[in-house]
Every structure is written in C-alpha cells, then in structure tokens.
C-alpha cells in the first residue's frame, strides 16, 4: 500500500509569548513545529515514529496565521507519505517549539525550547475530506485539519490495491475509486483485453482484435461471418458448411456445372419442337412436321416431298406449294391428264393402256424406270437404306450399301461387336464403344486390355462411394467407379435425379 | 508445468530470412490469459523485445524491427513462429521465446533456454 | 521512442541492502517488471507491476516505482544474487528494456 497523512496547520496562537516552562520568549517565541506519527497507543509514548515525523521551518512570532504553501520550505499542508496498508488507526504528536537560531532549518540550532505540545489519538479512514480539530492549553491554542489520502495509482479504504491505467495489449481501462478495472469503451473481460466484435458477429466463426470489427475464420465471410464459403469453383451450388457444395436442383458433379435439366435451362429446341434431357448438356430435340436440324431450326421445304406428278415442276409458297404442270396435265398436284394414249405419252419403252373409255391412260414402266409416264431413271439409294452412316451406291439395277468399320448386312444394320475377339485379358468386361472396345479391369489388372499386372490395387482402400462398383485400369488414375443409379462424381459421391451415362473415372 | 522450446537454424546468410519456432508444452497455446512473445540478446548486450502474438493471431510488434518481422501461431501444433527478413550481421542474438501473462501485467513468467542465431556468409 | 536508463553496475557487500534503478518518462504511470539473468541462463521473473513478487521469488526482492522512477531492492543480499537485472516497462504495446545493471556482491 501507499498514502500520506496530509496535516494542514491553520492558526497558532501564543499571545503572552511564553515557553512550556514559564519563561518568556525575547524578543518573541519565532515558532517552529516537530510532527510524529506513529501506530495506534492508548498511552503515547516516546520512540520512534514508526509513521513518519516531519518539521517545519519558522513560521512565524508568537500568534500567527499558517498560510497554504504548495513548494518549498515551509510547505503547507504537511505530507507524511507512509508505503504500507493503511491500518485506519494512528497516534499524533504535534510540538511547537522556539528556536532562536537559523529561520529555515531551526531543528539543527543549539537552544531550542519547547513552547506547547498536544497528542491526538484515533482512527482516521482514509478519504478527500479534512478532519477539523483545536487544542487549547493554558497558553496556546493550535487549530489544524487532518487526512490520509492515497498516492497515485493506491486505491480502497486502506490504499493497498494498485491499479494504473492502461491503454495497451494487456488490458484497457481505468480504475475505479475502489481499484477495480472500469474497461475503456469496446472492452470486456477480467483485465479489459477482449474487445467487443461488432454487434451480430459470428461466436464461432468471426473474431476481433479491436471493438466493433468481425474478422472470418477460414471458410467464412460476411459482415457478420455468418455466411459459408462453398467449395472454390462451386458454380450453381450452396453450402451449409464451409468448402461444400450442394448441387441446385438440376445441376450435378463435383462442382454442380453439369447441366442435368438443359432443357429447362436453356431451351434448346425451336419452333415448338419436344427437348428431352439425356444425361450431364445432352439433350435431343424431336421437330414437328416440316422441321429438321439439331434444334429443329431449319424448315424444310414444302417441295421437299416432291408432291407434283406427270413432271409438273413445284415452287415453294409462304404456307404451301404450288405445281407448275407440263402440257397435258392439269390438277393440284398435276395428277389429271388431258393426253390419251394416241398421244404416245409413255417415255423410255413404257406401253400405254387407255382408261376411262380413253378418256385417260396409265404407262406400265420397263425396269429401272418410273413416274407416271416412265420418265425418271430409278434412283435406289433416294430412300437412304443404309443404316449406321452406310454409303449406298448404284449399281445398274440395283444398289449396294458400303459399310463403315464395326458393320455389316445388306444395309450395314448388323453391328460387328469389337469384344468378339474377345480384346480383354485375366478377365476383363469388354464394352463396345464408337472408338472401340474399352475394356473394364478386374483388381490387380490394368492397361487398355487388361495386360499390365498392378501390384497397388487402387481399389483395395475403397475409393468409391454409394455402392459404386471399383474398377482398375481404366484411367491414368488406376481406377474408376461405377456409380449406381441416382449418383455422380469422381467417386459416384454426389446424389443426382438421373443415372449416369458412363462410369465416371477418377 | 509448461515448457517453451525454441528450434531453427542457427546460421543465417546475410539478407536472407531468420526463421524460428517456439513450440510450448504442457499447457495450450490457446489460452485467452496469455501473450506469446520474441525477445532476443546480442552477444553480450541486453534484452530487445521483438514482438508477441494472441492465439487469435492479433501480433503486436517492435516498431525498429516492424517492416521486417512477421509472427504467426499454429493453435493445432502448439507453436508460434518468428520471421525476420533482410538479415544483417546486427541480427545475431539469441533468439528467446517467452509467455507473457495478463494476470502479471504483461509480465514474461516463462522463457525458452534461447538458442543463437549467427548472420554470417 | 520510450526508453528506460539503468546504471550499468552497481556494487554490494554480501548481507547489505542493493538498490537499482530505472528511470524513464512517466515511470510511475505504469507498471515496472524486474527479471534477473545469470550468465549462460534464461532471464526470471523476480517483480511485476511495481512490487508484486512471483511465487518461489524470495521476500528480500521488492520493487517501488513512483515518478520518473522504479527501483528493484535486495535486502540481505547473498553471492547468489550476484547476476545481471533488466527493467521492462509497456509504452503502449511495445515492450522496452532498461539496458542491464551488472550487480557484484563483493568478497
């Protein structure tokens, strides 16, 4: 602890002039004080004074006012400073003395002589507020005021608790007239360390080194620190929990950019055509009569199915067609004839026969000849009989089809499977693809055909997930998964409304 | 009882990167009572705070040394780190790490044993 | 930049009371912390603000600071006690060191 006993003189009167002992002071008593303070003693006695003592220099004749004085000699009031806990209770002796020597240090003259004495003992708690007394004797009268106050920094009843203030790292605050911390503005905790985040600011998930400010912990953000980070490069998903990413609906894959709903997405399909969704951006686009193109896009000609006869030529119209007929033939489509048969209508060897009493004909065609009066040369490949990208070809009467590689028959319908040869070694699935067979390893075995022996089975730590099935070889990665219906991913880890295409390789 | 070690090179090439760790055990790093700090030692001179960090990662640091220090925390390993970029000869000390306690004002009531770090070519 | 000044040595027969100082601006207005070092060692801890004492710390260290002033007193000073001691003070968040007083107990 640390104090003063402050003591401030105010008037001392010794109108006679008169020692303790009787004697008179000549010229006048020149006054001096001697002060002790020591612990509590029911009787005072001499010895130490274990509080402190202090003296005065002369500070006047006789009777005399004590005027505050702030530095210097003959300061006033009096400080007793004390370092220890301040037990409320003390013994003072003040002592006015004659010195008829030296003003300003009176207490080293030679011939000093006491004029008056008194001793005051009690408790005193310590405070801002003086204590006001007066001692009479029969030849004095001193009147002063008392107190004890706390130094600097020493707080509490008994000046023992220290606070300073502080405005740093290890606390921020003030200090109560009892001690304790008062936090500064922002602060909270037991020394004013922990600033107080901004309001609403995440418990968990923000932080802050100074008031009114929410710093993220990794995989949040936000103002607040209330808002997940999805996984980086996240595209149409969500996250409860940071680096997760929840497909939207209609979205898959590791990072929801696959496309699973193209069609509502982006409406591929034109001019009213039926889009049907076919796996991660497939779609096929089904056109109405008159369309055709991937997206339907392109109208087909109304000429297109060639609807004029009897060689009438046909010329597309805004909604419809209209047939430009040949001499002889009249009708929508060209379909009525004013010839007969003495008109020799029948082309390229065709013979006539009349009809309706000759008011009309009918050629009967020789081979590789047709229309209504034998007049085109039969093209056989017009109807496209090949199947499976076929090239059909004439061939005098008749036409073949030239088959692309993995087919065969007449008109290249039969599939030539790439796994009859049985490509596949130590067991493997073949799969007929349009680049060729690929073939599915069993644990232990990868390669294109199985043929290299694997001595890490990328399997064995099962890697996939949902009930996928594992396969080795397929992949630079040594394995691939086969999701099951309703999943996706690398791993077959990701839920979907639609099954995949292909097995995924990881 | 809680125990700091200090561990690094101790031979550092001029204007290159001093790097040391502190790793404390015994108690955890996490702790809201306590600051975790760098104060070294010239060859036969006196001490220099460098700086200190909070678990939360707020860093506190010496304003001569500021543009060239960096202190980090690792809550997960129990340690913390000191950077000190652009060495010169004037860097070579020993490097001691120390807790610095709320509850003594600041005061450092545990250090490492320090280990010497020589800038030299 | 806050500094604090300490002698660099001071002198003490073995028995008898040793005081070092540290001066700095304000020194009172904060909180002083005293560490002793002896040669090859760690510093310790022997006061914190101003005159508090760690436990294991014996009772002749004290510490007072008021003014422009702290002081670390050894009453009964042993040959033990012989090391150097470093004042610390916070201005701010920086933490400064006095430069070191070499204290020899003599005989």
């Known amino acids: 602890g640390s104090g003063i006993f402050q003591l401030r003189l105010q008037e001392f009167v010794n109108q006679r002039g008169m020692l303790a002992n009787g004697q008179s002071c000549e010229p006048g008593c020149r006054t001096f004080f001697r002060i002790c303070l020591k612990h509590f003693q029911a009787t005072f006695s001499e010895g130490p004074c274990t509080f402190g003592n202090v003296s005065t220099p002369v500070l006047g004749t006789n009777s005399f006012v004590v005027r505050d004085k702030n530095s210097g000699s003959g300061r006033n009031p009096l400080q007793l400073p004390f370092n220890f806990t301040w037990p409320g209770t003390f013994s003072l002796n003040i002592q006015a003395w004659h010195t008829p020597g030296d003003d300003l240090r009176p207490e080293t003259s030679p011939g000093n002589s006491l004029i008056s004495q008194i001793i005051i003992q009690g408790s005193l708690a310590v405070g801002k507020i003086w204590r006001t007394d007066e001692q009479n004797d029969t030849l004095t009268r001193l009147s002063y005021s008392y107190r004890v106050i706390c130094s600097d920094n020493y707080y509490g009843e008994s000046c023992s608790r220290l606070c300073k203030k502080r405005d740093d790292h290890f606390g921020h605050y003030e200090c109560q007239p009892d001690g304790s911390l008062s936090c500064l503005p922002g602060w909270t905790g037991k020394y004013c360390d922990q600033p107080i985040c901004l309001s609403g600011c995440h418990e968990q998930n923000g932080y802050c080194s100074k008031p009114d400010e929410c710093i993220c912990r990794p995989g949040w953000q936000g103002r607040l620190c209330n808002e997940c980070i999805p996984h980086n490069g996240c595209r149409h998903g969500t996250c409860s929990i940071p680096w997760q990413c929840a497909c939207d609906e209609g979205w898959g894959g590791l990072f929801c950019d696959q496309d699973l709903n193209y069609c509502t997405h982006h409406s591929p399909c034109k001019n009213g055509s039926t889009c049907s969704n076919s796996g991660p951006k497939g779609y096929t686009c089904t056109c109405l009569p008159g369309y055709t193109g991937e997206h339907c896009e392109l109208g087909l000609s109304k000429c297109a199915s060639n609807p004029c006869r009897n060689g009438g030529s046909c010329k597309d119209q805004e909604n419809s067609y209209h047939c430009l007929c040949p001499p002889g033939y009249y009708g929508q489509h060209c379909e009525h004839s004013t010839l007969t048969c003495a008109d020799s209508p029948c082309f390229n060897g065709g013979s006539c026969r009349e009809r309706n009493q000759g008011s009309s004909y009918a050629c009967e065609c020789p081979p590789n000849f047709t229309g209504s009066n034998c007049e085109k040369k039969v093209d056989r490949c017009t109807s496209n009989p090949c199947a499976n990208g076929g090239q059909c070809q004439n061939r005098g009467p008749s036409r073949t089809c030239r088959c692309r590689p993995g087919f065969t028959g007449t008109h290249c319908e039969l599939h030539i499977s790439d796994c009859a040869r049985s490509p596949c070694a130590h067991g493997g699935t073949c799969h007929d693809l349009e680049n060729g067979p690929v073939c599915t390893c069993p644990a232990g075995f990868s390669g294109r055909r199985c043929e290299v022996r694997i001595t890490h089975d990328a399997c064995a730590s099962g890697p996939c997930f949902n009930g996928a099935t594992c396969y080795t070889g397929l992949s630079p990665n040594n394995f691939v998964c086969n999701c099951p219906y309703g999943f996706v991913g690398s791993r077959c880890e990701f839920p979907v409304g639609l099954p995949p295409s292909f097995p995924w390789v990881a | 009882e809680v125990q700091l070690q200090e561990s690094g090179p101790g031979l550092v090439k001029p204007s290159e990167t001093l790097s040391l760790t502190c790793t404390v055990s015994?108690?955890?790093?996490?702790?809201?009572?306590?600051?975790w700090g760098w104060i070294r030692q010239p060859p036969g001179k006196g001490l220099e705070w460098i700086g200190d960090i909070y678990y939360t990662g707020s860093t506190y640091y010496n304003p001569s040394l500021k543009s060239r220090v960096t202190i980090s925390v690792d809550t997960s390993k129990n340690q913390f780190s000191l950077k000190l970029s652009s060495v010169t000869a004037a860097d070579t000390a020993v490097y001691y790490c120390?807790?610095?306690?709320?509850?003594?004002?600041?005061?450092?009531?545990?250090w490492g044993q320090g280990t010497l770090v020589t800038v030299s070519s | 930049s806050y500094e604090l000044t300490q002698p660099p040595s001071v002198s003490v027969s073995p028995g008898q009371t040793a005081s070092i100082t540290c001066s700095g601006q304000r020194l009172g207005d904060k909180y002083a912390s005293w560490y002793q070092q002896k040669p090859g060692q760690s510093p310790v801890l022997v006061i914190y603000?101003?005159?508090k004492r760690p436990s294991g710390i014996p009772e002749r260290f004290s510490g007072s600071n008021s003014g422009d002033t702290a002081t670390l007193t050894i009453s009964g000073t042993q040959p033990m006690d012989e090391a150097d001691y470093y004042c610390?003070?916070?201005?701010?968040?920086?933490?400064?060191f006095g430069g070191g007083t070499k204290l020899t107990v003599l005989g």
């Open positions: 120390a807790r610095q306690a709320l509850a003594l004002g600041g005061g450092s009531d545990k």
């Open positions: 603000e101003d005159s």
């Open positions: 015994g108690g955890s790093i996490s702790s809201s009572s306590y600051y």
């Open positions: 610390q003070a916070w201005d701010r968040d920086t933490g400064v």
